[in-house]
Interface confidence: medium
């Protein structure tokens, strides 16, 4: 595929990545799939500067990010190392709370109203942010 050198229409460029901010809500898996269909992934936050940039756009609204522990350990969807990477959890989070009565614990991470992170039930219909890196090979076939 060809390298992406500029962001798609309605995406915002920042530090060699492109971001798309939803205005509706989906379950985490549906949001994850939406981003993948756009040749992107749910946002992966690697620094305080990126955290601030994303929060600037989403405001004080619960919003999914590309971080989950559905298979055990916490993992970023793009393979970024969780243990050594940037974190911005709320105090006492993540807590894998079972008291919500929806079955199971809490396996998906989201931005809360103050920007810090919380784990929650993955089926909740929150807004989401997609991210794709510039200069990566896109999956589109080359023009003939």
């Amino acid at each position: 595929g060809s390298e992406r050198t500029c962001c798609p229409v309605n995406w915002v460029e920042h530090e060699r990545s492109c971001y798309w901010f939803s205005r509706s809500g989906k379950a985490w898996a549906d949001a994850d799939n939406y981003c993948r269909l756009e040749d992107a992934h749910l946002v992966v936050v690697t620094s305080w500067e990126e955290q601030k940039f994303v929060q600037h756009h989403i405001g004080p609204v619960n919003t999914w990010m590309g971080l989950h522990d559905q298979n055990g350990p916490w993992k970023w969807v793009d393979g970024t190392d969780y243990e050594t990477g940037f974190k911005n959890w709320r105090p006492e989070q993540p807590d894998d709370w079972y008291g919500h009565g929806l079955g199971g614990g809490e396996d998906c991470a989201h931005f809360t109203d103050d920007g810090r992170w919380n784990d929650d039930v993955c089926q909740r219909p929150y807004r989401w942010v997609c991210e794709t890196e510039l200069d990566k090979a896109s999956q589109e076939p080359p023009l003939l």
Epitope: V12, E13, H14, E15, Q55, H56, H57, G59, P60, R116
Partner: antibody, heavy 119, light 110 residues
Framework: QVQLQESGPGLVKPSQTLSLTCTVS??????????WSWIRQHPGKGLEWIGY???????YYNPSLKSRVTISVDTSKNQFSLKLSSVTAADTAVYYC???????????WGQGTLVTVSS | QTVVTQEPSLTVSPGGTVTLTCASS?????????PNWFQQKPGQAPRALIY???NKHSWTPARFSGSLLGGKAALTLSGVQPEDEADYYC??????????FGGGTKLTVL
Amino acid sequence: QVQLQESGPGLVKPSQTLSLTCTVSGGSISSGGYYWSWIRQHPGKGLEWIGYIYYSGSTYYNPSLKSRVTISVDTSKNQFSLKLSSVTAADTAVYYCARDSPLRGFDYWGQGTLVTVSS
Amino acid sequence: QTVVTQEPSLTVSPGGTVTLTCASSTGAVTSGSYPNWFQQKPGQAPRALIYSTSNKHSWTPARFSGSLLGGKAALTLSGVQPEDEADYYCLLYYGGAQVAFGGGTKLTVL
């Protein structure tokens, strides 16, 4: 040290378009990570955010002014510009340009330029 | 349109302590609003004092501090100096990359 300097006509006639330019020195607009902003202050009043632009060209405007505002960037000149159309006397104000860093907020400001709308 | 509200005016004695607040019509101000505070003296451009609730710029005097207080952003001046007499503005960030300034507080040092 980043410095910003506004320039443009100090007098604009009603119904015309106000045009201002902000020249940035001490740092490159195209280095990324910053929003280049316009703010105004009516005489004796508070500050009003007009809008800003990212170096890639993405713009964000105050909803109350959106229909009349255009902000553009010229990275080759390290400048960004404001155009405000169909001005009236109510647009008479000191216009400031400023840099907004997602990490450090509105940290650097120009000294401001007074624009009077009068025939 | 979001409205950001500040006390129109406050008076403090030299050496005293005063707290200015900043409220949002959308509800409680949180750290996710990344409150900024600015000082403006007559005939001058605003000067940034505080960013992201409580962080000081390198030029911000130690007597200025920012915090969240009862659902509002707050700027506290401790050991007020005569040169602190000025207008003070807060700024809040909102979703969609929008920002809004407060109406300003005129601080008089008597």
